[in-house]
Interface confidence: low
Amino acid sequence: RGVFRRDAHKSEVAHRFKDLGEENFKALVLIAFAQYLQQCPFEDHVKLVNEVTEFAKTCVADESAENCDKSLHTLFGDKLCTVATLRETYGEMADCCAKQEPERNECFLQHKDDNPNLPRLVRPEVDVMCTAFHDNEETFLKKYLYEIARRHPYFYAPELLFFAKRYKAAFTECCQAADKAACLLPKLDELRDEGKASSAKQRLKCASLQKFGERAFKAWAVARLSQRFPKAEFAEVSKLVTDLTKVHTECCHGDLLECADDRADLAKYICENQDSISSKLKECCEKPLLEKSHCIAEVENDEMPADLPSLAADFVESKDVCKNYAEAKDVFLGMFLYEYARRHPDYSVVLLLRLAKTYETTLEKCCAAADPHECYAKVFDEFKPLVEEPQNLIKQNCELFEQLGEYKFQNALLVRYTKKVPQVSTPTLVEVSRNLGKVGSKCCKHPEAKRMPCAEDYLSVVLNQLCVLHEKTPVSDRVTKCCTESLVNRRPCFSALEVDETYVPKEFNAETFTFHADICTLSEKERQIKKQTALVELVKHKPKATKEQLKAVMDDFAAFVEKCCKADDKETCFAEEGKKLVAASQAALGL
């Protein structure tokens, strides 16, 4: 029943153009190009996309026309390599163009930058945006795709089309409203926050495929889809996993046209077969394509079948466990994961994968023993501490969150993580700890049965951000170790890290703690980031500082900012009071 088995096409570019339509074709090519050449100006990309589109149209008209039989990688790579400033702008990435396909594409992929040196996107005034939208809607929306894609080179391309559709809808509605700003700004904030979350989730999928292989991704998908579709048969889940793996492998590999096309096919298949998949898909399947695919990806878990037998019968008590395992190891482990996951929507996916790994390790050992059954009889007892560890951690941290509130909870995590891995750059520590801290508002409100899947799977996404940023400029062996040893044990690995006793404290630099009147005009969020940056620097100077010492200094700092922002001569206040604050902080921390 393979969805993706298609007849061979004479011209791949014509095939994708016809399947996707001109609008989606152009949008996806623009995303692909912007994700590869992240520094190129918008106008250059638009020109390249238009040239590719014109070429595709000639191939639709005549599939046997010259070059129409070339692979998409060859066509797109050749086009990217025509950029005149490649060497000056991208340095060694230009060497990719000396290679042949498929390694030229591999080379481009390896030069994708998770943290490109691009200016922060500043939102113009609402009237300015509405004028630009009305003047040239098409260019306005292309600019959105371009700006998001170049800043998020692994953004899930078909999902970015869905975001662009919502972005357009927001402007269409709000630019006609009486109070444009009140209508538009909350929608843009929501899109921005959802977009960042979507980008980070997709980045984890790509890291899983690229760093740990297809088997790791498939295991994740079996667990997640079994939780979501507990009434589906194992064969059905396996088929969905195979197809989903193909879609994500394509998108992570830069094959965005194939990815979008195959995702549409997968949505179509799921909707045609909802009776054997899930009772929760009806509403999703009535929506247009982009909304449909998004809705399916976010659909709530179906109810568990009422009469599921005990797992022990097939996976512990049966005399055939080793025989079944030996015959087809991955299939047997897949069935174990499926059966366990569909019974446990209350577990995180990473916990389910840890349990499956423990089960696999036990069978590897026991099936070679004199009495295999005796050896693996107590395997389920080994699961208890694995289940309790995240439960206890979430309970403690939700209590702390409820006691402190989000900002102070983030600060507690900033201190905790800076002490664990003080070599990591301050902006990265601030960004990651702020995101780790958001787990409180996101997950602690949920009942017990939903807390762990929410919290631990979200933490996996955030810690992957740390891993990909650290990989670009590695500075800590401990981070490298936690990031590379095991995908499913990253969070426990980071949780287990103690204060780094080998760290030599940073030299004190008063400049780091010098503030100016511009802080007064910042938004509350940006002001928090300034204060949290100072907190990380304090911990790097004085890693042995106690919570109480750090709290006292941060309270003084908050009072200092508040006082000077109310002063008539703000700049003088920041200069004079700032010196006093630095001196007092040094004394308080014994610097």
């Epitope: 591999e106 390896q110 495929l209 690229q210 740990f212 292989g213 297809e214 492998t249």
Partner: nanobody, 115 residues
Framework: QVQLVESGGGLVQAGGSLRLSCTAS????????MAWYRQAPGQQREFVAR???????NYPDSVKGRFTISRDNAKNTVYLQMNSLKPEDTAVYYC?????????WGQGTQVTVSS
């Protein structure tokens, strides 16, 4: 991590044959594709052959019909059978592997084709 060790290089007359082997160890379950590359002195590293987990292969025109890549999954080994060797095939041959693209590399084995 994945470790790759090449063997089988050496000196051979033009028109002769050689068979290179590359054995993988470590986290080999993550490996979906393996390949051979080569680098002649002062030249760019160049792609020679690739094989996917499913067994599909591809080659550049310069070696097509002369070189064959194959793999023995049981031995975690990939082979490169090189026939009708030419002096311009002289290079250090590297084995490479990875889950989605080649990110792990061997140390290389020297192949010299004399005329």
């Amino acid at each position: 991590q994945v470790q790759l060790v090449e063997s089988g290089g050496g000196l051979v007359q033009a028109g002769g044959s050689l068979r290179l082997s590359c054995t993988a160890s470590g986290s080999i379950e993550s490996i979906n594709r393996m390949a051979w590359y080569r680098q002649a002195p002062g030249q760019q590293r160049e792609f020679v052959a690739r094989i996917s987990k499913g067994g599909s292969t591809n080659y550049p025109d310069s070696v097509k019909g002369r070189f064959t890549i194959s793999r023995d999954n049981a031995k975690n080994t990939v082979y490169l059978q090189m026939n009708s060797l030419k002096p311009e095939d002289t290079a250090v041959y590297y084995c490479a592997a990875g889950p989605v693209w080649e990110q792990f590399w061997g140390q290389g084995t020297q192949v010299t084709v004399s005329s």
